[in-house]
Each structure stands twice: as C-alpha cells, then as structure tokens.
Interface confidence: medium
C-alpha cells in the first residue's frame, strides 16, 4: 500500500477472476477509483471500477475471461494498482505484485444435493465451481450443519482433508429440519483462504418408524 492507512487485498479464484478490496481511512466516497491489472507475461491487461461496500472500503472483480478459462498460472505475477481520479489525472493509491496461486480463494461449492436421507443420517454431495485443473486432488473442505435452535457460528466444523465432494452426516435426530453448508480451500498458496460458504442446503431427516426406539 502507498500509505499506512490503506489496505489492498486481492484473491484469485484459480480460473478467470481476481477479486479485490481496497480500504482507506479518510478517502472520499465519491472519488472514482479503479483496479488496473498488468500481468508480467500475458498479452492482456484488465481494469475494474471500485464500488463502495462500506464507509471506507471498495471492491471490484477483474474478469479475465470466460468463467472456466485458465488465465493465470503459478509462475505469473500480476501488478495490481489502485488508481483514483484527481481532477484530470489518475493517482496511484496502492500497488502490489500479485502472485495468483499464492493468493487463492475459490468460488463457493455449488449443486448441493441430498443423495440419501434416513432417520439418523444423511448423505450429501456437491460440486466445486471454476476450480483450476492444476489442483488435481489437492483440495480440502470444511462443512457445517445447522441444528434447530443453534446459529451457524455454533455449528461444529467438519474437516475433509482430501478432495471428497460428499459427506455422510451421522447421529442426526429423526424428523428434524437441518441446514448444511460447505466450503473449499486449495492446499497451495501462502495467503490462500477458504472460499465463501455454499448456499445452505435444507433437508429433513426421516421420522422414526412407529413403535421403534430412537
């Protein structure tokens, strides 16, 4: 960052999107600012308009190509600059040498579905979205289940230390409404972080058979 009150953070979704957030104390809300991306060895550059997301932070997405196109690799370096208009000229407010595969945040898993549900267990599957083929199987997942009367923050995390796009939830209560979420993270990258949580999948366990203990 150009000065100490400025923070410029970007993540690569591993395919064709770099999402950036820039925050600066005391910056004017109505200033027009952009993120400029200049790769070190690619024949394109890209710009996105920073839009306010809070009082002192702005965000934008650099769309590098079609969603599943592999636009960057582990050896790329992309110079990212925040440029803000000052009268007739542009001023550089922040800069970073962005190494995409050191700063990964994948898209949230999609297509969650109940494969099989019983009284005490439920098998759920999902798919990863726009994830690079470079990862092969080097991904991990976290999942959580929302029980009645609890919050998501209280839900214990279940960790899947391999690329496993399903889970069998056990010890559930019969005839009970639950919600389920999952997120994904590549093993690669010093600053890599978890994807956003998936959209919650609601499901209900089967009622216990009459006359049987639960």
């Amino acid at each position: 960052a150009v000065n100490g009150t400025s923070r410029f953070t970007c993540f690569y979704n591993s395919r064709a999107n770099i999402s950036c957030v820039w925050s600066q104390d005391g910056a004017l809300q109505d200033t027009s600012c952009q993120v400029h991306a200049w790769p070190d060895r690619r024949r394109w550059n890209q710009t996105c308009e920073l839009l306010p997301v809070s009082q002192a932070s702005w965000a934008c997405n650099l769309i590098l190509g079609t969603p599943d196109s592999q636009k960057l690799t582990a050896v790329d370096i992309v110079t990212l600059r925040v440029m803000c208009r000052e009268g007739v000229r542009w001023r550089m407010m922040a800069i970073q040498d962005f190494k995409p595969f050191e700063n990964l945040r994948l898209m949230a898993p999609i297509s969650l579905q109940v494969v099989h549900v019983e009284t005490h267990r439920c098998n759920i599957s999902w798919k990863i979205s726009q994830a690079s083929h470079y990862f092969e199987r080097h991904l991990e997942f976290e999942a959580r289940t929302l029980s009645p009367g609890h919050t998501w923050e209280e839900a214990p995390l279940m960790t899947l230390k391999q690329k496993q796009e399903w889970i069998c939830l056990e010890t559930l209560t019969p005839d009970t409404q639950y919600e389920f979420q999952v997120r994904v993270k590549p093993l690669q990258g010093e600053f890599t972080t978890w994807s956003p949580w998936s959209q919650p999948l609601a499901f209900r366990t089967k009622p216990a058979a009459l006359g049987k203990d639960t």
Epitope: W38, P39, R41, I77, T79, D97
Partner: antibody
Framework: EVQLLESGGGLVQPGGSLRLSCAAS????????VHWIRQAPGKGLEWLGA???????QYNAAVKGRFTISRDNSKNTLYLQMNSLRAEDTAVYYC?????????????WGQGTLVTVSS | DIQMTQSPSSLSASVGDRVTITCQAS?????MYWYQQRPGKAPRLLIY???NLASGVPSRFSGSGSGTSYTFTISSLQPEDIATYYC?????????FGQGTKVEIK
C-alpha cells in the same frame, strides 16, 4: 527517453561483496519491473532476477541467497548486492527493462558494468 | 529450467544472403524473443512475441515458430548485421537465453 546506467563494478576478491547500482531515468521504477542480467566473458546471457513494480523480487535459483535486488524509489535507482563472490561471477552485469508491457521483451538495457572476481 | 538450444553456434555468410537461426526449447514456450549483440555493446531487442519487430528494427529481420521450435531470419544479410544473436523465453522463470549464434561475413 528511457535510460539505464549501471555503476559499481570493479575488481573484488573471492568471498568478497560488491553492490552494483542501476540509475533509471525517463520512467519511474515503481511503474516497471527491472531485471539484472549478466554475461561472463565470451559467454551467453544469464538472467539473475527482477524487482517488480510493487517491490517484490524474483531470483534465478543459481544466485538466490547470495544476490539481493533492491531499490531506492526516491533516487529512482536499483541495486544488486552480491555476496560470497566466486570466480565464476566474473561478468558484465546489465540492468534491463521491458517495453510498455513486460512481455514486450527487454527493450531497454544499460551499457553494463564489469565485475572481476580474482585474487 | 527451460533450456534453449540455438543452432548453428556460428555461421559465415555473404552480404545479401538469407540467414536462418533456430532455437529449440526443452519444453513448450508461448513466445520467443530475439536479440542482437554487437561486440562490446549491450544486447538490442529485435523481435518480441515470436514475430513482432521491435521499434526501429529493419524489416529484413523476422521471426516465426511455436511450441518448442522457433526460427529467426535475416532475409538479406548486411555488413552491419555482424553480431551474436540470442533467443530468449519468457514463459516461465528463470528466464533463459540461448547460447548465442555468431554471424560473420564471408
């Protein structure tokens, strides 16, 4: 006009250290990556490393740990700090910058500075 | 590292001759760069992105190729073309150069 001017070369004993400078003019070192390349007498070109616009560095594994690239933005100058020098480090050292886009190749070169490592 | 192998290592040709230099990469590269270095001088960029002529470079110089095989051509050799020519890849780090081809006049 873009210009690069190296200095700081000379004779140094094996195991010694030397710091080369590359004074840039006609552009800001915070806007372009600048690279160091060397050429041993009668030999080909060897890329040593680069310092990118944002200040991060990249090195050839052959010199990583012994050579350090840095810059002084206020002086618009790049540096190559060379430690634990060996006879095989004897070469002309160039700084170079790509064209307007990095992938344009090394469009701008300094005149080079000779480093001789010998006892 | 990607190894760049130039051939020939030296050649002698007459003024007006067509001169061709090849550069073989040890693995596929996206684009190739070619430089001219006259004795005692810094290298000069001639070709970037495989086939694009750098600013101020005469049109007798050209480049082509893809994958692992690239070619540099001087369509009509001139006395001022006496120099060593280098190929270079910028597909992966470390950046690497060919060992050079020395061009002389017969």
């Amino acid at each position: 006009e873009v210009q690069l001017l190296e200095s700081g070369g000379g004779l140094v004993q094996p195991g010694g250290s030397l710091r080369l400078s590359c004074a840039a003019s006609g552009f800001s070192v915070t806007s372009y990556g600048v690279h160091w390349i060397r050429q041993a007498p009668g030999k080909g070109l060897e890329w040593l490393g680069a310092i990118w616009s944002g200040g991060s560095t990249q090195y050839n594994a052959a010199v990583k740990g012994r050579f350090t690239i840095s810059r002084d933005n206020s002086k618009n100058t790049l540096y190559l700090q060379m430690n634990s020098l060996r006879a095989e480090d004897t070469a002309v050292y160039y700084c170079a910058r790509a064209g307007d886009a990095n992938y344009d190749g090394f469009a701008y070169w300094g005149q080079g500075t000779l480093v001789t490592v010998s006892s | 590292d990607i190894q760049m192998t130039q051939s020939p290592s030296s050649l002698s040709a007459s003024v007006g001759d067509r001169v061709t230099i090849t550069c073989q990469a040890s693995s596929s590269v996206s684009f190739m760069y070619w430089y001219q270095q006259r004795p005692g001088k810094a290298p000069r960029l001639l070709i970037y992105d495989t086939s694009n002529l750098a600013s101020g470079v005469p049109s007798r110089f050209s480049g082509s190729g893809s994958g692992t095989s690239y070619t540099f051509t001087i369509s009509s050799l001139q006395p001022e073309d006496i120099a060593t020519y280098y190929c270079q890849q910028w597909s992966t780090y470390p950046l690497t150069f060919g060992q050079g081809t020395k061009v002389e006049i017969k």
